[in-house]
């Protein structure tokens, strides 16, 4: 399945210098994602049709079992490592959702567009987080987990897993935006 975000087993050999005010840029990207998360969630479940819009708690609740943890009271370094893991997980999951939606809802162009725009911001965020980890904390490698592979699921499961992931995304991105 496509991975819109492909982290390398990074050594701290950053080709380009990090942006000035890197943490501000990370905060800004998190705020941007948080600002659009609810609209993306609504757009998604609306596009799936029944029974999704009338069963959000059951079908789109944020119960994603293997989602990477986040501790808002950790050190900056610990929070950045956890943020990195979350962004990788979200990025791969979003890639799967986008791929599935192009098959299941080919005419939902505004949804495809919003998914792609979100993936773009996540890509930039990942780059900035890695830059910060490398430049300030000399962390060049973070063990990550990827979002679930939906390629073998049936139509309903694809839709449901996507909805649960976006419900979780909406929830976690608000926490992340506050924590930084």
């Amino acid at each position: 399945s496509p991975l819109p975000i492909t982290p390398v087993n990074a050594t701290c050999a950053i080709r380009h210098p990090c942006h000035n005010n890197l943490m501000n840029q990370i905060r800004s990207q998190l705020a941007q994602l948080n600002g659009s998360a609810n609209a993306l969630f609504i757009l998604y479940y609306t596009a799936q049709g029944e029974p999704f819009p009338n069963n959000l708690d059951k079908l789109c609740g944020p119960n994603v079992t293997d989602f990477p943890p986040f501790h808002a009271n950790g050190t900056e370094k610990a929070k950045l490592v956890e943020l990195y893991r979350i962004v990788v997980y979200l990025g791969t999951s979003l890639g799967n959702i986008t791929r599935d939606q192009k098959i299941l809802n080919p005419s939902a162009l505004s949804l495809h567009s919003k998914l792609n725009a979100t993936a773009d911001i996540l890509r930039g965020l990942l780059s900035n987080v890695l830059c910060r980890l490398c430049s300030k904390y000399h962390v060049g490698h973070v063990d990550v987990t990827y979002g679930p592979d939906t390629s073998g699921k049936d139509v309903f499961q694809k839709k449901k897993l996507g909805c649960q992931l976006l419900g979780k995304y909406k929830q976690i991105i608000a926490v992340l935006a506050q924590a930084f």
């Epitope: 049709g49 592979d149 073998g152 699921k153 049936d154 309903f156 694809k158």
Partner: antibody, heavy 119, light 106 residues
Amino acid sequence: EQLVESGGGLVQPEGSLTLTCKASGIDFSSNYWICWVRQAPGKGLEWIACIYVGSSGDTYYANWAKGRFAISKTSSTTVTLEVTSLTAADTATYFCARTVEPYDNLHFWGPGTLVSVSS
Amino acid sequence: TPEMTQTPASMEVAVGGTVTIKCQASETISGYLSWYQQKPGQRPKLLMYRASTLASGVSSRFKGSGSGTQFTLTISGVECADAATYYCQQGYSYSDTDNVFGGGTE
């Protein structure tokens, strides 16, 4: 492109058997499901199970088939269906069929293999 | 989990007439419904998928419609070669399902 089932025949009640679905002209490495469907003499189509032949190997079973039927991918061109504790009610023609993502229709079917359960 | 009910179980029609077969899902399956034709001693043949898309090589006399829970297959200008059993199949959810096929219409 062709699917061919084999492994059918006469089986004793309470016996087991393994049916094989062999593909030619495709290999099971892309986004396919292979499904097994059976048809008792003079009756309708009854779905048994499906398997995703990609890396995740997702499987789906009809409620009534869970436990006694096991679908698996055994090579890049074969999928098997193991059936245990056979009874006369399992007498049927067993078809394998292929579907592509999003797995909503069975596009290609094999000719079927007849399983007869009798003492 | 969607279960499929097909009506009628059997019917007769004169050559040149029109046949309407109905298929009802116990819950919404969006538009993920397929229709198959099976002649005695043969394997099933896909006629229609996504409720209304004709499969490759199938005559345009076959028309599918519906969405949600109610679906219809219409055969117009019926020919002797159309004598067969027709089955609907939901392709929306395979989890916790007894059968994805309807009972058939002969």
